[in-house]
Interface confidence: medium
Amino acid sequence: HNTTVFQGVAGQSLQVSCPYDSMKHWGRRKAWCRQLGEKGPCQRVVSTHNLWLLSFLRRWNGSTAITDDTLGGTLTITLRNLQPHDAGLYQCQSLHGSEADTLRKVLVEVLADPLDHRDAGDLWFPGESESFEDAHVEHSISRSLLEGEIPFPPTS
């Protein structure tokens, strides 16, 4: 799998989309997991509703939400109030039994918060950044990881 990069702004919301073949993955629940190390396990963050027919319902774990359009074949993950520690490698998964197929490998990059540079004369409400429903705070800049690019930031 190629890795797709999604960039989001710190303090705002990031939407990650994972397209898949809706027929091939019919009846399967989906999950979002975080890769622990380059060869480590993928730790489950959140999964879709236990009843596959209700996969369209948004489920939350902390600040991460998941929803699945099973007909259209798009899994959507929302990372609310994105923070620097959210940066890293993730996977969208399709579950069957105890197995999991990787739908997409995702590298989340967190950009600096431009709000930090707003001056006092601006009218800014904290809740505007927290509200993932507001279209103007949704950012999803994605690109494919180039061959040879390292999906993990160097450890300090």
Epitope: S63, Q83, A120, G121, P126, G127
Partner: antibody, heavy 122, light 113 residues
Framework: EVQLLESGGGLVQPGGSLRLSCAAS????????MTWVRQAPGKGLEWVSA????????YYADSVKGRFTISRDNSKNTLYLQMNSLRAEDTAVYYC???????????????WGQGTLVTVSS | DIVMTQSPDSLAVSLGERATINCKSS????????????LAWYQQKPGQPPKLLIY???TRESGVPDRFSGSGSGTDFTLTISSLQAEDVAVYYC?????????FGGGTKVEIK
């Protein structure tokens, strides 16, 4: 010393219009967001409208949306509130206030004028 | 809209005694990016405009006496006057400055017993 002086209040009939002004001095008006807050006689505070320093952003309470317009003239250090289609329930003392804003603080009203009374009655 | 509910509506306290005012918001006003609560308190004396006392739930505005203190987080907040003075007779309002529309509590009238 920060001074905010409201004017333009008075008695107006329902359906009528008024334009309130707020003359600011003692601070750099052009770098401060501003707001209008009202208080009906014997009642609590109700936020009405706010405008960013460069007038690029405006907000209105649902109760006045479509009837009131906030504006400012930074060259005259003056804030305005154009009030149209006035109703009896708009009767109140109208205060103008400077907003301490920006990323960290969020809008708090740090300096207030003395207010101007608007009475809507036939 | 965030609804701010204050209690009690009025409060009579002896001079030098503690006065406590509560404010509850219908949703959290805690901004998780900086862990600050966007809740302010104002004092309005008879015939005067309101005056900012506290913002971020617990940060006193400069010049405000230290007998005024704010506490709380999320949805439940308290303004405390540790030792009531005659000049503290006023109506006190909480206000959320977390998201528009800005909303105020209904006010609490503090009197001397």
């Amino acid at each position: 010393e920060v001074q905010l002086l409201e004017s333009g209040g008075g008695l107006v009939q329902p359906g009528g219009s008024l334009r309130l002004s707020c003359a600011a001095s003692g601070f750099t008006f052009s770098t401060h967001a501003m707001t209008w807050v009202r208080q009906a006689p014997g009642k609590g505070l109700e936020w009405v409208s706010a405008i960013s320093a460069n007038a690029g952003k405006t907000y209105y309470a649902d109760s006045v949306k479509g009837r009131f317009t906030i504006s400012r003239d930074n060259s005259k250090n003056t804030l305005y509130l154009q009030m149209n289609s006035l109703r009896a329930e708009d009767t109140a003392v109208y205060y103008c206030a400077s907003l301490r804003g920006g990323y960290e603080v969020g809008p708090t009203f740090d300096s207030w004028g003395q207010g101007t009374l608007v009475t809507v009655s036939s | 809209d965030i609804v701010m509910t204050q209690s009690p509506d009025s409060l009579a306290v002896s001079l030098g005694e503690r006065a406590t005012i509560n404010c509850k918001s219908s949703q959290s006003v805690l901004y998780s990016s900086n862990n600050k609560n966007y809740l302010a308190w104002y004092q309005q004396k008879p015939g005067q405009p309101p005056k900012l006392l506290i913002y971020w739930a617990s940060t006193r505005e400069s010049g405000v006496p230290d007998r005024f203190s704010g506490s709380g987080s999320g949805t439940d907040f308290t303004l405390t006057i540790s030792s009531l003075q005659a000049e503290d007779v006023a109506v006190y309002y909480c206000q959320q400055h977390y998201i528009w529309p800005i909303t105020f509590g209904g006010g609490t009238k503090v009197e001397i017993k």
